[in-house]
Amino acid sequence: IFPLAFFIYVPMNEQIVIGRLDEDIILPSSFERGSEVVIHWKYQDSYKVHSYYKGSDHLESQDPRYANRTSLFYNEIQNGNASLFFRRVSLLDEGIYTCYVGTAIQVITNKVVLKVGVFLTPVMKYEKRNTNSFLICSVLSVYPRPIITWKMDNTPISENNMEETGSLDSFSINSPLNITGSNSSYECTIENSLLKQTWTGRWTMKDGLHKMQSEHVSLSCQPVNDYFSPNQDFKVTWSRMKSGTFSVLAYYLSSSQNTIINESRFSWNKELINQSDFSMNLMDLNLSDSGEYLCNISSDEYTLLTIHTVHVEPSQETASHN
């Protein structure tokens, strides 16, 4: 990731680099070519990050936290490149780095501000707690503190509970919303302003379906074009809620185009899948198939939840036998 700001004529150049937790980054620094190159990278003007002079690294007094995590672009030093390759950044690495570059001609000092962000893919969950229904938007690890917004039928909701747990290096956040008795559609957006990354969860409840025993049911599940990008890896899961917990009926992975089916009466139409239609059929219904069916389409950028309520009623024959 390269700098957002680079002021060429200011002697103390200050650039901003945004890194992602556990990924590698480059702290940029350039200089006018010259002989006898000396490069010293320091953190917060105190800790030695990397030293290079007389043609080789000198890491004897390198701060232990940088051991085996830093290197220069050795083949490019003679071309004026003093950038530092920095492995596996952590939130503790955030701060100001100073690059001192000296040659027989001149000495320059560059400052680089490193900011580190975390955004582990959030999830949207649908939960039943006794007689209440909840939608929960949660993110296991995020930094800095994200902006969470809820919408009901595309209208922002001001009520926004946030359960926050802060660990040493990031936040874990749950935002539950009570949707008991509602037929509205809901949307939750979690935004990491530093990483400029936004995730959206969308929940839609379909009209209840009444079916007779032994019949089949077709349940629709089509992504909303606003979020869905077929080029992006995603996963589709169909599950059924039984006594408060969901059991997975089938799932599809776009990366491998694999479909795994756990319920023999479940069927997916391959042709429809190719058209990004993940509607499913459940054959030979029985009374125990009554309940809520959840289609979950998830990628790194969104989760689309579609809920169907199915009521299976005894057929006339079954009823008359009883």
Epitope: S35, E36, V38, H40, K42, D45, K48, Y53, K54, S61, Y100, G102, T103, A104, V107, T109
Partner: antibody, heavy 120, light 107 residues
Framework: QVQLVESGGGVVQPGRSLRLSCAAS????????MHWVRQVPGKGLEWVAV????????DYADSVKGRFTISRDNSKNTLYLQMNSLRVEDTAVYYC?????????????WGQGTLVTVSS | DIQMTQSPSSLSASVGDRVTITCRAS??????LAWYQQKPGKVPKLLIY???TLQSGVPSRFSGSGSGTDFTLTISSLQPEDVATYYC?????????FGPGTKVDIK
């Protein structure tokens, strides 16, 4: 142009202390390593100590280790040499000198020197 | 620590002569060697660094060579203003020891 002006020399008894100063101008002092070099009148040059540009690293000649301390104040553009437990053999002209770069190279500019005489 | 020796300790030569001074390190120092000239009553002046690179403003009659342990400073045609003591200094790592010096004068 680079200017280095030493001060603080004088006559001192063995065992006593003295602090030399070097006022630097004409260059960005905080960007360069600095050395002290001494010379007994009529004899050769002896390297004494070096300090890196930001003061983080210091090195000394064996003959002064544990007795002399090099330091710098970058906000005042000044280099210092604190000399304790002085001996007769420390009598010399002390030169303040600028390193080519950060404190790991040769001297490219010298001051005029200040004479330290250790005598009882 | 690495010791630096110079030879000869002094020499006399005629104006126009080629003069060679040798500096030897007790261990290899690559090309991290500088040469200084100190005229009587003056402060030292840098002549050559990196064993063979001439400092700007220094006359081209001065040249340096060598690498590892053996180095030479050559004055191709001695001039009256070259009367001085010449010192080598290692700077591969501290301590940055000087050689004992070679005094050059005119016959």
């Amino acid at each position: 142009q680079v200017q280095l002006v030493e001060s603080g020399g004088g006559v001192v008894q063995p065992g006593r202390s003295l602090r030399l100063s070097c006022a630097a101008s004409g260059f960005t002092f905080s960007n360069y390593g600095m050395h002290w070099v001494r010379q007994v009148p009529g004899k050769g040059l002896e390297w004494v100590a070096v300090i890196w540009y930001e003061g983080s690293e210091k090195d000394y000649a064996d003959s002064v280790k544990g007795r002399f301390t090099i330091s710098r104040d970058n906000s005042k553009n000044t280099l210092y040499l604190q000399m304790n437990s002085l001996r007769v053999e420390d009598t010399a002209v002390y030169y303040c000198a600028k390193d080519l770069i950060s404190g790991i190279y040769y001297v490219d500019h010298w001051g005029q020197g200040t004479l330290v005489t250790v005598s009882s | 620590d690495i010791q630096m020796t110079q030879s000869p300790s002094s020499l006399s030569a005629s104006v126009g002569d080629r003069v060679t001074i040798t500096c030897r390190a007790s261990q290899g120092i690559s090309n991290y060697l500088a040469w200084y000239q100190q005229k009587p009553g003056k402060v030292p002046k840098l002549l050559i660094y990196a064993a063979s690179t001439l400092q700007s403003g220094v006359p081209s009659r001065f040249s340096g060579s060598g690498s590892g342990t053996d180095f030479t400073l050559t004055i191709s045609s001695l001039q009256p203003e070259d009367v001085a003591t010449y010192y080598c200094q290692k700077y591969n790592a501290a301590p940055f020891t000087f050689g004992p010096g070679t005094k050059v004068d005119i016959k």
